[in-house]
């Protein structure tokens, strides 16, 4: 009888089934959906909480202009394909045999096509943009200590490495979190940017991926963030390739 | 970029003997943990043994204990499964997967493609 076996759980993701039936009785987990093994001392990657998801019953400017290239994920929620590892297939298909190429967040990069539709390589989001108005305060907030305390979040509860974490910018109501990871710099056991801000963007919402831990309570100084309206904008490596008559719509 | 490479894979009698090799690459492993998995049609993957990285400890679970004994040699980047006294319900693909084993956790990462064991009766 081993701790594993009273506590078999996924700290790191929910949207899971445990048993203690790995080797010396340790808890061993798969995600729903997909039923792949999932690393718990570590964010899942959002191909697999997404594929679980759909699985689950349904319910004078400092601030970053966003460039042209920037994706806005307004296709919503799909049942992805993932690769052995978890991560998103270059070429995502529906029921229907329509098809689209996406980026390393699962984001729509291309125009919808068939099944000839080729995607020949997984485009990585190396920049991502995550927007966010606040509710009314009293005053603005301390920019260094908001810039502190976000910073120390995606550190300690996303397990984001700082350096990925490149600004964070505030014009009271508007905040704006910078994450920036190439290729080059992903070292392996690196939390992804994608994974990081998924998570963030599931517990602004209230929908905390993690297991038993109570939802984000976000405080600057002791004063609560309240969070009224998200956007997350995302930057690929390779711009997107969308026919003129989208980008004219 | 990881790359396992399985190999030994056949079709034997009830009660026979197979070894099962895999070539591992692209990452350090004689610092790593590695796992046999298996998965049989229409179920979901079982690992089957477990050996860590320096060879010192093994783990197998009960459906396979005493008949199969995982081992490998670092200078030579290869894991191994040998198993003797093969049963019907052995037959699946055999896939070496390196792991992670924690206090409390156990997780495969990387999977090879795998080779196919067939026992016939």
């Known amino acids: 009888h081993t701790a594993a076996q009273d506590n078999c759980t996924c700290p790191t993701n929910k949207m899971t089934v445990c048993s203690p039936d790995g080797p010396g009785g340790r808890c061993q987990c798969r995600a729903l959906g997909s039923g792949m093994a999932v690393d718990c001392s570590t964010l899942t990657s959002k191909c697999l909480l997404l594929k679980a998801r759909m699985s689950a019953p349904k319910n004078a400017r400092t601030l970053v202009r966003p460039s042209e290239h920037a994706l806005v994920d307004n296709d919503g929620l799909y049942d992805p394909d993932c690769d052995p590892e978890g991560r998103f297939k270059a070429r995502q298909c529906n029921q229907t045999s329509v098809c689209w190429c996406v980026n390393s967040v699962g984001v729509r990069r291309t125009d919808k096509g068939d099944l000839s539709l080729r995607c020949d390589e997984l485009v990585r989001t190396h920049h991502i943009l995550i927007d966010l108005r606040h509710r009314p305060t009293a005053g603005a907030f301390n920019h260094s200590d908001l810039d502190a305390e976000l910073r120390r979040l995606f550190r300690e509860r996303y397990r984001l490495h700082p350096k990925f974490v490149a600004a964070v910018h505030y014009e009271q109501p508007t905040i704006q979190i910078e994450l920036r990871q190439n290729t080059s710099q992903k070292a392996a056991g690196d939390v992804d940017i994608g994974d990081a801000a998924y998570y963030f963007e599931r517990d602004i919402k209230g929908e905390s991926l993690f297991q038993g831990r109570g939802g984000l309570d976000l405080r600057v100084r002791g004063e609560p963030l309240q969070v009224e309206r998200t956007l997350i904008y995302y930057l690929d490596e390779i711009p997107p390739k969308f026919s003129m008559k989208r980008l004219t719509a | 970029q990881v790359q396992l490479q399985e190999s030994g894979g056949g079709m034997v009698q009830v009660g026979g003997s197979l070894r099962l090799s895999c070539a591992a690459s692209?990452?350090?492993?004689?610092?790593?943990?590695m796992s046999w998995v298996r998965q049989a049609p229409g179920k979901g993957p079982e690992w089957v043994s477990y050996i860590n990285a320096d060879g010192s400890k093994t783990y197998y679970p009960d459906s396979v204990k005493g008949r199969f004994t995982i081992s490998r040699d670092n200078a030579k980047n290869t894991l191994y499964l040998l198993m003797n006294n093969l049963k019907p319900e052995d037959t699946a693909l055999y896939r070496c997967?390196?792991?992670?084993?924690?206090?409390?956790?156990?997780?495969?990462?990387?999977w090879g493609q795998g080779t196919q064991v067939t026992v016939s009766s």
């Open positions: 997967a390196r792991a992670k084993l924690t206090d409390t956790h156990y997780v495969e990462d990387y």
């Open positions: 692209g990452f350090p492993f004689s610092s790593a943990d």
